[in-house]
């Protein structure tokens, strides 16, 4: 298990149920880097934080998965959490 994966999980586990739901919805439309696909909506909406972390890392690998997670958190107004996530992955 990598540092970035742990940091993603830590961030997602700190979201309220309502925020996690919003995170998933934003993930469905967040701008992606070229060459990356979108996690299918059906699979996404029922996932808990641990399953979502696994899916993010399998789809986007650790480095980009962490960056993408941080960007979605920023889109949600959670800049502090995004900064903590990125700081943890760059330690």
């Amino acid at each position: 298990m990598g540092r970035a994966r742990d940091a993603i999980l830590d961030a997602l586990e700190n979201l309220t149920a309502e925020e996690l739901k919003k995170f998933k919805l934003k993930l469905l439309s967040v701008p992606l880097r070229e060459g990356y696909g979108r996690i299918p909506r059906g699979a996404l909406l029922s996932m808990d934080a641990a399953a979502l972390t696994d899916k993010l890392v399998s789809f986007y690998l650790e480095t980009y998965g962490a960056e993408l997670t941080a960007n979605v958190l920023r889109d949600m107004g959670l800049q502090e959490m995004a900064g903590q996530l990125q700081a943890a992955t760059h330690q």
Epitope: N71, R74, D75, E80, G83
Partner: antibody, heavy 114, light 107 residues
Framework: QVQLQQPGTELVKPGASVKLSCRAS?????????????LEWIGNINLSNGRTNYN??FRAMATLTVDKSSSTAYTQLSSLTSEDSAVYYC?????????????WGQGTSVTVSS | NIVMTQYPKSMSLSIGERVTLRCKAS??????VSWYQQKPEQSPKLLIY???NRYTGVPDRFTGSGSATDFILTITSVQAEDLADYHC?????????FGAGTKLELK
């Protein structure tokens, strides 16, 4: 188009407090603008869960609260001085990505004077 | 805090001119930059978000570009109604910060 409702003017004495209101939704920001100056972000509050963020510069003087039942955000500004005479805007972030301030109230002009 | 530096502070121009307004962030802010237009005695209005996304209803003569630390707002052919103050702002980190603004005036 969403309209953010703010009262127009407030006249307060030095050292006093004022509570500004804004009918809004989602994340509501408060922004200060002194005459002829730029924009300064005071802080924001999430109307659905009450989560707040403050600019440290304003943390001692500004308190952000929300009344969910009326979808109203408030900022209480305390121990006011002449430097606090400004227009105070509320703004919402409703665009799904990049967290811009896409809806702005008309602003409340606060004059601090004895 | 992230400092947003805007330049020039003011510009005098003629109708129909092409205008380039610049905004520099003191550190990498990705694409988390917005541009706002503010006319006298009015509240700011969102023009561009995410560095390059034109907001609903904004004329296509307004174009945003840039990423990381350097950002540009271009107005391809300035109209009389574009004479206003323009503010850039970042939403990458708290506290959210704005530039001091650029004033567009008529020559």
């Amino acid at each position: 188009q969403v309209q953010l409702q703010q009262p127009g003017t407030e006249l307060v004495k030095p050292g006093a407090s004022v509570k500004l209101s804004c009918r809004a939704s989602g994340w509501t920001h408060w922004v200060k603008q002194r005459p002829g100056q730029g924009l300064e972000w005071i802080g924001n509050i999430n109307l659905s869960n009450g989560r707040t963020n403050y600019n440290e510069k304003f943390r001692a003087m500004a308190t952000l609260t929300v009344d969910k039942s009326s979808s109203t955000a408030y900022t209480q500004l305390s121990s006011l001085t002449s430097e606090d005479s400004a227009v105070y805007y509320c703004a919402n972030s409703m665009v799904p990505h990049f967290f811009p301030m896409d809806y702005w109230g008309q602003g409340t002009s606060v004059t601090v004077s004895s | 805090n992230i400092v947003m530096t805007q330049y020039p502070k003011s510009m005098s121009l003629s109708i129909g001119e092409r205008v380039t307004l610049r905004c520099k962030a003191s550190e990498n802010v990705g694409s988390y930059v917005s541009w706002y237009q503010q006319k006298p005695e009015q509240s700011p209005k969102l023009l561009i978000y995410g560095a390059s996304n034109r907001y609903t209803g904004v004329p296509d003569r307004f174009t945003g570009s840039g990423s990381a630390t350097d950002f540009i707002l271009t107005i391809t052919s300035v109209q009389a109604e574009d004479l206003a103050d323009y503010h850039c702002g970042q939403s990458y980190n708290y506290p959210l910060t704005f530039g001091a603004g650029t004033k567009l005036e008529l020559k």
